[in-house]
Interface confidence: low
């Protein structure tokens, strides 16, 4: 079967886990987590729900270690559970790396467990309206990918790509590419999008025994990156930056400008172990806010993805596809917030706005 | 199954006033924007405002600002039109109808689910 | 706010016959466009989002378009459920406005 990737992995998310599956799942879509379970493991859970709520799951994977061992699947529906469905069986070893596949198949999810065939579990809502994966419990996940079947044979990792066409940027900093982004037929369409790609170079992530060693981009923007936000801002218009934090830095910044203002100034600081936010209005700072819901999200050397959602009275930020923050707008004349700036000590993969 | 149905039309004088209510079923309300539009009798379709609730967000045309209010009840999954200062130009089919949005992904720049309508005359 | 020029007002055409309706923006709405079809005493029902993207359930013979600030609704070849109105509507400000409409009517 011919895979192409259907969105750039996460590499290394941080569990809890919570992030975007872009355009939803769509019969063919195989969806593939490498990582390792604790040696204490008790149990883990990966749920493909509707939302960042978790009120409503389509699917809920869930192997328990206790009572010999066995996994649970169910379903969640404006948050009720549904009959659990029992497979006696566990596929998975406490400590152990492991590999597990999710295949979205037109009348049910097909399970795979380290390349081996281990349970099927029927929809029992439309797959379509999932568009969220979330991970918790007791492991380490090396990665989550998401792959096509049956669309031209391309190297997975050999670029980061989406299930539309991209054309990659001629020059470091990539003028920007339009593209379809949508969501799968029978749930509401998506917004266009504009995409900034990176061209990547083959580069060894990892090398943990048994988990085959993944290719990781190699970004190609110039730092500071500016880019138009066509239209400016507006409720529920969200921007998504990833990248890489350099092993020595001390601090980057992501701001949302309005003209000469800046409307949204987030900037995680390294050697203050905090994330800054303020609005620059005339050249003038206001009152800096830096209240985390939890601990700080950005670390040295470590990748990152960071979603902005603009609403009617705040910024919402989400790191890693975890909230992190809100932020009430100071500057009210959201349309005019117009320009995306990133700068510091990164390196950008991949910008969306 | 995701609905929407409008209700409160009726015939009013000039220059009274209206609540028309939208009550939706079928999808997580606060996720959605929710849209007015009116239909004049042979005429065409015109935006009257939006509401994404979630956010306490809306937006007005420029032909009922500061004579309509839209709000939401997110425990009743029910959007509002409050009409006053009503014209007889305001007589009109009004639809309600859904954008969706879901934390943290894109504007939906269409409208996928509408109501089947109910009709304001506005006449002395 | 933005407007969108949609044209023609009306056209006659027949069963198999491939029809263009076009709307123009005054202003830069991105590909933010949907285009819809409403028969009389009935609510619109959604063709096309984002300028060129087929929403599910809508036959194929129905396409979209962009070219800058023009929009394009195709019907590649005409079937007789498919006489109505269409609108286009953008959504590239904060107002979203629509088109005043085209009526296909069977020649």
């Known amino acids: 079967m011919a895979l192409f990737s259907a969105q750039s992995p996460y590499i290394n998310p941080i569990i809890p886990f919570t992030g975007p599956i872009q355009g939803g799942l769509q019969e063919g879509l195989q969806v593939t987590l490498q990582g390792t379970t604790k040696s204490f493991a008790q149990r883990f859970v990966v749920n493909f729900q509707n939302s960042f709520n978790g009120n409503d799951i389509a699917f809920h994977f869930n192997p328990r270690f206790e009572e010999g061992g066995y996994v649970v699947c169910n379903t969640k529906q404006n948050g009720q559970w549904g009959p659990e469905e029992r497979k006696m069986q566990m596929p998975f070893q406490k400590g152990m790396p492991f590999e597990l596949c999710f295949l979205v198949q037109r009348s049910e999810f097909k399970v795979m467990v380290n390349k081996k065939f281990f349970v099927q579990y029927q929809h029992r809502v439309p797959y379509h309206l999932v568009d969220t994966i979330a991970v918790s419990g007791c492991l380490k996940l090396s990665f989550i990918t998401f792959q096509n079947s049956a669309a031209p044979v391309q190297h997975v990792f050999s670029t980061l790509q989406f299930s539309q066409p991209v054309q990659f940027p001629r020059t470091p900093k990539g003028r920007k590419q339009k593209t379809q982004n949508f969501r799968p037929a029978h749930q509401a369409p998506m917004a266009q999008t504009t995409i900034h790609m990176v061209h990547s170079t083959p580069g060894q992530m990892f090398s943990t025994p048994g988990i085959p060693p993944v290719v990781y981009p190699t970004p190609a923007y110039t730092i500071p990156f500016y880019t138009p936000i066509p239209n400016g801002l507006y409720p529920s218009k969200s921007i998504m930056i990833s990248g890489n934090v350099l092993p020595d830095a001390t601090r980057f910044h992501i701001n949302l400008r309005c003209g000469g203002d800046i409307a949204f100034h987030l900037n995680p600081r390294f050697n203050e172990n905090a994330v800054v936010r303020n609005t620059q209005i005339n050249n003038s700072w206001g009152q800096e806010e830096r209240s985390l819901l939890g601990r700080m999200p950005f670390s040295r050397g470590q990748s990152f993805s960071v979603w902005i959602i603009c609403e009617g009275h705040c910024f919402k930020v989400a790191v890693n596809g975890q909230h992190m923050c809100e932020y009430y707008h100071r500057l009210k004349n959201l349309q005019d917030i117009n320009t995306l700036e990133v700068a510091g000590d990164i390196q950008l993969t991949h910008v969306q706005t | 199954e995701v609905q929407l149905v409008e209700s409160g039309g009726g015939l009013v004088q000039p220059g009274g006033s209206l609540r028309l209510s939208c009550a939706a079923s079928?999808?997580?309300?606060?996720?959605?924007?929710i849209h007015w539009v009116r239909q004049a009798p042979g005429k065409g379709l015109e935006w009257v405002a939006l509401?994404?609730?979630?956010?306490?967000?809306?937006q007005y045309a420029d032909s009922v600002k500061g004579r309509f209010t839209i709000s939401a009840d997110t425990s009743k999954n029910t959007a509002y039109l409050q009409m006053n200062s009503l014209r007889a130009e305001d007589t009109a089919v009004y639809y309600c109808?859904?954008?969706?949005?879901?934390?943290?992904?894109?504007?939906?720049?269409?409208?996928?689910?509408w109501g089947q309508g109910t009709l304001v005359t506005v006449s002395s | 706010d933005i407007q969108m020029t949609q044209s023609p007002s009306s056209l006659s055409a027949s069963v198999g016959d491939r029809v263009t309706i076009t709307c123009r923006a005054s202003?830069?709405?991105?590909?933010?466009v949907a285009w819809y079809q409403q028969k009389p005493g009935k609510a619109p029902k959604l063709l096309i989002y984002?300028?060129?993207s087929l929403y599910s359930g809508v036959p194929s013979r129905f396409s979209g378009s962009r070219s800058g600030t023009d929009f394009t609704l195709t019907i590649s070849s005409l079937q007789p459920e498919d006489f109505a109105t269409y609108y286009c509507?953008?959504?590239?400000?904060?107002?979203?406005?629509f088109g005043q409409g085209t009526k296909v009517e069977i020649k």
């Open positions: 984002s300028a060129s």
């Open positions: 109808a859904r954008v969706g949005t879901t934390y943290p992904s894109r504007y939906l720049e269409a409208l996928d689910y």
């Open positions: 079928g999808f997580t309300f606060s996720s959605y924007v």
């Open positions: 509401i994404y609730s979630s956010g306490g967000y809306t």
């Open positions: 509507q953008q959504f590239g400000s904060s107002l979203p406005t």
């Open positions: 202003q830069s709405v991105s590909s933010a």
